[in-house]
Interface confidence: low
């Protein structure tokens, strides 16, 4: 499937503290318009044995809330201005990890979908549900490729370091593109 095709590639990111990429600033996943990004939540076997059975570095099953944030929110790992995209709160889900799928579509097909633009970066961070887990996991998504065909967009893309290309295709487990984000209240400042 070529860039911008109706059926895009799928990219997988495993969102847990064992994923060293997420623990440093700069990790970027590059996608094309209409690609999917599948974010897999931390997952542990109920039996406590086998792959994925062990808890993260802090001990206990990791649980996170994923937010879409501004560049400033990404840099400071601050979700106060972002909105909730997904909650990783079922670490012992049966059979397989919970997955959140984001489709990088130019036009939102869902009432609560999102409109993405080629040549731009988008930012995701998580906050741990329990303090003992990794404080700041974060990721940039770069939507390729620059285009001037929509709404007068003239992006000036600068591909960051640590850019990851498409992964192999993976099976669809469940898509939550229409899931309602819950918005955190702003406290004192809206200046970012």
């Amino acid at each position: 499937q070529g860039p911008g095709g109706a059926l895009g590639n799928r990219h997988a990111v495993y969102w847990n503290s064992s994923n060293q990429h997420l623990r440093r600033e700069g990790y970027t996943v590059q996608v094309n318009v209409n690609d999917y990004l599948d974010i897999y939540c931390p997952h542990y076997n109920s039996s406590g044995v086998g792959p994925g059975a062990g808890p993260g570095p802090g001990g206990g099953a990791e649980q996170y809330v994923l937010y879409m944030v501004s560049r400033n929110g990404y840099r400071t790992c601050n979700a106060s201005q972002g909105f909730k995209r997904w909650e990783c709160n079922r670490p012992h889900a049966p059979h397989s990890p919970i997955k959140f799928s984001e489709k990088f579509q130019r036009y939102s097909a869902f009432s609560l979908g999102y409109e993405f633009h080629a040549g731009h970066e988008y930012y995701y961070i998580s906050t741990p549900t329990h303090n003992l887990h990794w404080k700041c996991l974060r990721m940039k998504v770069f939507v390729c490729c620059a285009s001037t065909s929509h709404s007068g967009e003239k992006p000036v893309p600068t591909l960051p370091q640590f850019t990851m290309g498409p992964n192999v295709k993976i099976n669809v487990l469940e898509d939550f593109e229409g899931e309602n984000p819950q918005v955190p209240k702003l406290e004192k400042s809206i200046s970012g």
């Epitope: 879409m68 560049r71 400033n72 972002g82 036009y107 988008y122 003239k154 992006p155």
Partner: antibody, heavy 121, light 106 residues
């Protein structure tokens, strides 16, 4: 605190170009956000015209796409609006505002006081 | 483009009265934003993400809605609330504003 201030020509003749400058203090325009131009016509209708993002990318409203250019001078922390081939219909108060880039969570949170530009022979 | 239609265009309310104004979009949107503008001043962000009050906005204001239909409500009108209120969307390009509702004191 973040402050934006527009400076404009006041009066422009039809068919000429309109140029407005926005000077930003208290926040670097290369740090984050998009830096927008919004105008308000005499009947109070508001129209988003376009932006230049922190990275220098631009995005324009199709209604003015063929006539507009938004640029910046990062050394002066300024960004600029140029609107070509103006007519009397372009008479408006021109505002600069800080807002979201592409669509990530943000809003027009800081606005300049606006500058009135009249197009008249 | 996604046209936002505000109604009524002009309204008046007595002090202490409940006020509701509406904004309808011709295509469904994710969130509505509201701005307050007073004479000879620039618009101020008033409500974001449909229902969240911007810092400094009195608690008598509230926002609600989904899909195509949104509203701003003042539980008890006060003199300082006299202004024009604009709705605005970021969901689809180009970003658009409503025509405004001018709220006057009766």
């Amino acid at each position: 605190d973040v402050h934006l201030q527009e400076t404009g020509p006041g009066l422009v003749k039809p068919s000429q170009s309109l140029s407005v400058t926005c000077t930003v203090t208290g926040y670097s325009i290369t740090s984050d956000y998009a830096w927008n131009w919004i105008r308000q016509f005499p009947g109070n209708k508001l129209e988003w015209m376009g932006y230049i993002s922190y990275s220098g990318g631009t995005r324009y409203n199709p209604s003015v796409k063929s006539r507009i250019s938004i640029t910046r001078d990062t050394s002066k922390n300024q960004f600029f609006l140029q609107l070509n081939s103006v007519t009397t219909e372009d008479t408006a108060t021109y505002y600069c505002a800080r807002g979201p880039y592409a669509g990530y969570p943000a809003w027009f949170d800081y606005w300049g006081p606006g500058t009135l530009v009249t197009v008249s022979a | 483009e996604n046209v936002l239609t505000q109604s009524p265009a002009i309204m008046s309310a007595s002090l202490g009265e409940k006020v509701t104004m509406s904004c309808r979009a011709n295509s469904s949107i994710n969130y509505m934003y509201w701005y307050q503008q007073k004479s000879d001043a620039s618009p101020k962000l008033w409500i974001y993400y449909t229902s969240n009050l911007a810092p400094g906005v009195p608690a008598r204001f509230s926002g609600s809605g989904s899909g195509n239909s949104y509203s701003l409500t003042i539980s008890s009108m006060e003199g300082e609330d006299a202004a024009t209120y604009y709705c605005q969307q970021f969901t689809s390009s180009p970003w658009t504003f409503g025509g405004g509702t001018k709220l006057e004191i009766k």
